[in-house]
Structures are given as structure tokens and as C-alpha cells.
């Protein structure tokens, strides 16, 4: 295999315990995707994340283990962007109401929406429980992370030709080798302390010319806030 | 191409455990999930439960409390125990491979069962 | 638990007839639904994946439909191999499947 090495997200690193606070499970009887705590009671995921009945997990580092720092509340509310697409993945963006109040601590906060958009060679934290192999599967019970730069919209564009509007960008590698993967969904592409991102698709994982594409925060911040309002 | 194959007592006293075990040959049972669905003789299919080959499982809420599934790498195999068994745990009992993550979306998400082993008759009387 | 309700139960038709099966679901799930095709005395076989997806080598007669709480399976023209019982599944939580229907030829 082109990247057969001890992998973690695909060639991440195991996240040092909480040290991600605002990443969450979501879970349906396994975990199937991510995401990201926005206020006491709301998270942001992928819209392709959709499901009827989510069980939010927060706290989290070992899935597979009560480790004692876990939170679990049940979504009250899982509201998928109106223009949501699932056959382009435009407006890969949800929003789930926690059923209570979320309790925070050390271990469980939130992050911050972006106050601009992302730049170009900015470094960021992806997380998430995602498969940790570029071929096969190997799903990691740690949360993993990776620290990878937002690549240029032209970049992007030119490694997947008319797939990319303007509410996705890039992030990762052009030689390929570190990349989310299946399982990464809904979760946080973190900036400078802001979410800019939320994992969405790509074309496999840790492809060569093949980067990660995410749904760009930036473009919601308006949406998100209304929504909230909306529903609180 | 990958086959299933069921295997394991057709006989078992009630309170009993069944054991089932099934064997993956043509492909490796790694990088996969896995499941057990039986049905009741003229009935209709209930799904067990489901494991990953680290050994991650997620069960039936209705029958978590009496199921515990288990996976053998190094013998391409894996397993189902249900333990206080009745006679309505009578059935044919199939093992199947899942269906994962088609497309370019990074979720986890399933689509069906697409190989089935042709699956055993378990009946449970004393 | 996610309710699958199934119709009808069964159903006669003629070779060449088009075939129309419903599913309903409790709750809304999306597009996690599946439909199988199970022959007597054998294990089910799924035709198609994700409510409308084709799986690889299943005749392009069988189509699937719908999302959310509605989902529909469609033979176009019956064929004698057809025969047997059709399954929907959901897997949106857990996995629960339909009561089934079966098909037979008049």
C-alpha cells in the first residue's frame, strides 16, 4: 500500500486525552460520525450525518471506554441545512439541539464560530474516531488528530473539477498520506481557535491530489445563529 | 469471491447458550462488519447484532441483554452466543456481511447485507 | 425501535405485469433503507442499497423509490424468477426489516 504505516486519523497522531474538548460522537449504537460543540446545547456536523434518533457523546477520548469523563445526551433536535444536496454535498452542514444542557468543564467546551473566512496555508487540528487506514479499514477507539493547512481554492478546484462550489474548501496534503477518513463526518477542521471547517468528503482518503474537502463554516455562521434563535 | 458458512449445534435445551460460529473463506473477514439475523420458521428476519473485526459490537436493544458476538482473525471467523434461550429463539440462524461506505461522504454508514451465508437451523427443545 | 410496515403481505400478478410494493417507516430515516429478495429455503439476497441504489448484477427491472417515511419497490415487467419474498430494511438506528411480501405468478 502507497501509505502502509501506523496511521491515526490517516497519518495523524493519537490526541492527547480531552485535549480536544468540543469534539463529540455521535452515536446510533456505534459511532458514525463526529462534530462540534458550538454552545451548551447545540453542536455542528455534516449534513450527510443525518439520521433520525442521534445520541450525542461528549467527553469523549476511548469510545469504547467508560472512562469517566463522558457526557451522553440525546439530540432533541437535528436540523439539516434546507439546501442540503446530497448528491454534490453542498450545504454539507447540520445542526443538532441537545435534549439538555451540556456541563462545562475542563474536558467539554465549546468552540468558537469563525469571524472570517479561512486563509490559505493556515494550519489546523482535524479530529475524529475515522478510519486510520488509506486502504482497508482500521477504526481507532482514540480520538486521532492531525495538524494540516487550508490548501488555495484553485488547488482545490483543480484536484476535483467541478465538485467544488464555494461553500468547500480544502485542507491536507497534495502528496497525499494524511487525510480524514470514513467515521471523521460532521467533525471539527479547527483554526486559530475557530471552527473554519466540518469534515464532508473526498475522493477516498489520503489520496495523492486527492485532499479532504470541507464544508466551510464561514458561509453559515448567519444561518447558524438564526436557527438557534429559532429554536430555542 | 467471499463465502459464509454457519456452523454450530441444531440442537439446544432450553436456558441453554447457542453457539453459533461462522466462517469467512474466499477473502479476509479484517477491514469488515459482520452480522447475525435469524428467522423464525414462516416468518420474517430479525437482526442480532453486528461486530467489527477489533471486536467492536453493536447489538438488538431487544436481545442485548443475552447476546454476546466475538470475532477470530487468525481463523477468519466469528461468533454468536445466546445465553436463557426459549423455544422462541428457534430459527434459522444466518451470518452476513455488511455493506459499508460507498461513495465519497466520510461518515460511517451501511448498506445492507450483500453476502449471506445459507444459514443453520437452530431449534431449542429439551 | 424503528417500525417497518410492509404492503401488502402478498400479492399475484402475471408474467410482464409491473409490481408495486410499499414501505413505511415509523419515523423519518432518510434514505437508510434496503430491499432484499429472499427464495425458499434460501438465504436473502440484496437488490438494492441506500432506497434507490442498484446493487452490482441485480436486473435493471427492480428499482427502488422515496425518503424519509415512504419508500417504494418496483418490479417493471415480472419475471418467473421473481418469485419469492421481498424484505425492506432500514438502518437509520439499529436495523429492523419489514414484515415482508411475497410474490407469486397468477
Known amino acids: 500500500a502507497p501509505f502502509d504505516d501506523d496511521d491515526k486519523i490517516v497519518g495523524g497522531y493519537n490526541c492527547e486525552e480531552n485535549s480536544v474538548p468540543y469534539q463529540v460522537s455521535l452515536n446510533s449504537g456505534y459511532h458514525f460520525c463526529g462534530g462540534s460543540l458550538i454552545n451548551e446545547q447545540w453542536v455542528v456536523s455534516a449534513g450527510h450525518c443525518y439520521k433520525s434518533r442521534i445520541q450525542v457523546r461528549l467527553g469523549e477520548h476511548n469510545i469504547e471506554v467508560l472512562e469517566g469523563n463522558e457526557q451522553f445526551i440525546n439530540a432533541a433536535k437535528i436540523i439539516r441545512h434546507p439546501q442540503y444536496d446530497r448528491k454534490t454535498l453542498n450545504n454539507d452542514i447540520m445542526l443538532i439541539k441537545l435534549s439538555s444542557r451540556a456541563v462545562i468543564n475542563a474536558r467539554v467546551s465549546t468552540i468558537s464560530l469563525p469571524t472570517a473566512p479561512p486563509a490559505t496555508g493556515t494550519k489546523c487540528l482535524i479530529s475524529g474516531w475515522g478510519n486510520t487506514a488509506s486502504s482497508g479499514a482500521d477504526y481507532p477507539d482514540e480520538l486521532q488528530c492531525l495538524d494540516a493547512p487550508v490548501l488555495s481554492q484553485a488547488k482545490c478546484e483543480a484536484s476535483y473539477p467541478g465538485k467544488i462550489t464555494s461553500n468547500m474548501f480544502c485542507v491536507g496534503f497534495l502528496e497525499g498520506g494524511k487525510d480524514s477518513c470514513q467515521g471523521d463526518s460532521g467533525g471539527p477542521v479547527v483554526c486559530n481557535g475557530q471552527l473554519q471547517g466540518v469534515v464532508s468528503w473526498g475522493d477516498g482518503c489520503a489520496q495523492k491530489n486527492k485532499p479532504g474537502v470541507y464544508t466551510k463554516v464561514y458561509n453559515y455562521v448567519k444561518w447558524i445563529k438564526n436557527t438557534i434563535a429559532a429554536n430555542s | 469471491q467471499v463465502q459464509l458458512q454457519e456452523s454450530g449445534p441444531g440442537l439446544v435445551k432450553p436456558s441453554e447458550t447457542l453457539s453459533l460460529t461462522c466462517t469467512v473463506s474466499g477473502g479476509s473477514i479484517s477491514s469488515y462488519y459482520w452480522s447475525w439475523i435469524r428467522q423464525p420458521a414462516g416468518k420474517g428476519l430479525e437482526w442480532i447484532g453486528r461486530?467489527?473485526?477489533?471486536?467492536?459490537?453493536n447489538y438488538n436493544p431487544s436481545l442485548k441483554s443475552r447476546v454476546t458476538m466475538s470475532v477470530d482473525t487468525s481463523k477468519n471467523q466469528f461468533s454468536l452466543k445466546l445465553s436463557s434461550v426459549t423455544a422462541a429463539d428457534t430459527a434459522v440462524y444466518y451470518c452476513?456481511?455488511?455493506?459499508?461506505?460507498?461513495?465519497?461522504?466520510?461518515?460511517?454508514?451501511?448498506?445492507?447485507?450483500?453476502?449471506w451465508g445459507q444459514g443453520t437451523t437452530v431449534t431449542v427443545s429439551s | 425501535d424503528i417500525q417497518m410496515t410492509q404492503s401488502p403481505s402478498s400479492l399475484s400478478a402475471s408474467v410482464g405485469d409491473r409490481v408495486t410494493i410499499t414501505c413505511q417507516a415509523s419515523?423519518?430515516?432518510?434514505?437508510?433503507l434496503n430491499w432484499y429478495q429472499q427464495k425458499p429455503g434460501k438465504a436473502p439476497k440484496l437488490l438494492i442499497y441506500d432506497a434507490s441504489n442498484l446493487e452490482t448484477g441485480v436486473p435493471s427491472r427492480f428499482s427502488g423509490s422515496g425518503s424519509g417515511t415512504d419508500f417504494t419497490f418496483t418490479i417493471s415487467s415480472l419475471q418467473p424468477e421473481d418469485i419469492a419474498t421481498y424484505y425492506c430494511?432500514?438502518?437509520?438506528?439499529?436495523?429492523?426489516f419489514g414484515g415482508g411480501t411475497k410474490v407469486e405468478i397468477k
Open positions: 430494511q432500514q438502518d437509520d438506528n439499529f436495523i429492523t
Open positions: 419515523q423519518d430515516i432518510s434514505n437508510y
Open positions: 461486530i467489527y473485526t477489533s471486536g467492536s459490537t
Open positions: 452476513a456481511r455488511d455493506l459499508t461506505n460507498y461513495g465519497s461522504g466520510k461518515s460511517i454508514r451501511f448498506y445492507g447485507m450483500d453476502v
